[in-house]
């Protein structure tokens, strides 16, 4: 259940809308029910009620990252900020917009060809899969020095959804992010109250697949707000 997970695992540094009063992690436990994933694994979420507060990058939209709004500001107050475009300064990959990654403090394109002379860890890490570069999914040609990288499979660690193979997205799983299947019709999904605001999700679900949207299940219309079940449904 949500209670058992939140009580058994310390969740700290959350802004008040998520974590309750400062210094009392997880005090907003009653905010949301535990929901069983169709597959059976536990899943928890706490909805965010204020605009874009966050504790981690993955709680923000795909074109955002989580940081203090003021330079050198209070680290305890973080919000979702717009991602940084190519050639802008950065400190980590998530700060850069999709299709880019952070290299030497600058957002650079992850589409450009990489050469062996570069540090391999930097190259492969931009794809979130540096542990699968040899016998796993990276293939190098002997004729060219360019490196080709195949996307992460289900269960692979990732940084963002573009790191994952088709039909998968990059979603929170405990203290990491891994490639998980995009949701199919009829599967339970998470409806976020505010665009870009992902709340706290210990076992985060992917979004609904193409042609599907996350809506309240018809037979759950009468249920209370907090217990409404959302599923992926045809538009």
């Amino acid at each position: 259940t949500l209670n058992s997970v939140l009580n058994s695992n310390a969740i700290k540094n959350l802004p008040p809308p998520l974590g309750g009063a400062a210094g009392h992690p997880g005090s907003a436990v009653s905010a949301a029910p535990g929901i069983l994933y169709p597959g059976g694994n536990k899943y928890q979420t706490i909805d965010n009620y204020q605009p874009y507060p966050c504790a981690e990058d993955e709680e923000c939209g795909t074109d955002e990252y989580c940081a203090s709004p003021t330079r050198g500001g209070d680290a305890g107050v973080q919000i979702c900020l717009a991602c940084r475009k190519r050639r802008k300064r950065c400190m980590r990959h998530a700060m850069c917009c999709p299709g880019n990654y952070c290299k030497n403090g600058i957002c650079v394109s992850s589409d450009q060809n990489h050469f062996r002379g570069e540090i391999e860890e930097t190259i492969t890490e931009s794809f979130g899969n540096d542990h699968s570069t040899l016998d796993g999914y990276s293939r190098r040609t002997t004729l060219s020095s360019k490196m080709y990288h195949t996307k992460g499979q289900e269960g692979s660690v990732c940084l963002r959804s573009s790191d994952c193979a088709s039909g998968l997205c990059c979603a929170r799983h405990f203290w990491s992010k891994i490639c998980k299947p995009v949701l199919k019709e009829g599967q339970v999904c998470t409806k976020h109250r505010r665009k870009g605001s992902h709340g706290l999700e210990i076992f985060q679900r992917c979004y609904c697949g193409e042609g599907l949207s996350c809506r309240i299940q018809k037979d759950h219309h009468q249920a209370s707000n907090s217990s409404r079940l959302h599923t992926c449904q045809r538009h």
Epitope: N13, N41, F174
Partner: antibody, heavy 115, light 108 residues
Framework: QVQLVESGGGLVQPGGSLRLSCAAS????????MTWVRQAPGKGLEWVSG????????YYADSVKGRFTISRDNSKNTLYLQMNSLRAEDTAVYYC????????WGQGTLVTVSS | DIVLTQSPATLSLSPGERATLSCRAS???????LAWYQQKPGQAPRLLIY???NRATGVPARFSGSGSGTDFTLTISSLEPEDFATYYC?????????FGQGTKVEIK
Amino acid sequence: QVQLVESGGGLVQPGGSLRLSCAASGFTFNNYGMTWVRQAPGKGLEWVSGISGSGSYTYYADSVKGRFTISRDNSKNTLYLQMNSLRAEDTAVYYCARTIYMDYWGQGTLVTVSS
Amino acid sequence: DIVLTQSPATLSLSPGERATLSCRASQNLFSPYLAWYQQKPGQAPRLLIYGASNRATGVPARFSGSGSGTDFTLTISSLEPEDFATYYCQQYGDEPITFGQGTKVEIK
């Protein structure tokens, strides 16, 4: 190349405290969740604790909850495990490892709890 | 908690032989969130397989992982002298993360 080096182990009396450190290099530290795993002498592996890339989320095994605290200093590329109220059954080699399935491991540091 | 039971506890084989190690979960792992590790005496474990079937960096092609649900298998197609070690499976699908008790592959 990715390297993880643990330190801080040693002999401590029951009820005592120790702080383990894990210095990371060769990768962008704050992009990865980190994990502590232990192995009692002659026994199997046991997951102890995990922490997200920013340090915002921490997780603990029931056996150490309330006694151990995982933390990280991303400016120093270092992972920590503060161990309080140590018991004889905490005697083990403690490994730090990267991410949720442990793709890189340190060499381990031995913690012995004995009177 | 999901309990992982590995069998056999010990596997006695000769170099060149095929090794099949089993890892059975007490509950269905609805996603392939299972990893395999190799550990030699006095050394840290080494990741071999993640996501049930994906080989990690530098792991030879003779190692392969398969399975789903409750039954997972690590296969070493042809044992090399350096493969004699203890192998652990680990699930990262549910809380808490758990390991199997290990299978020791020894020289016959």
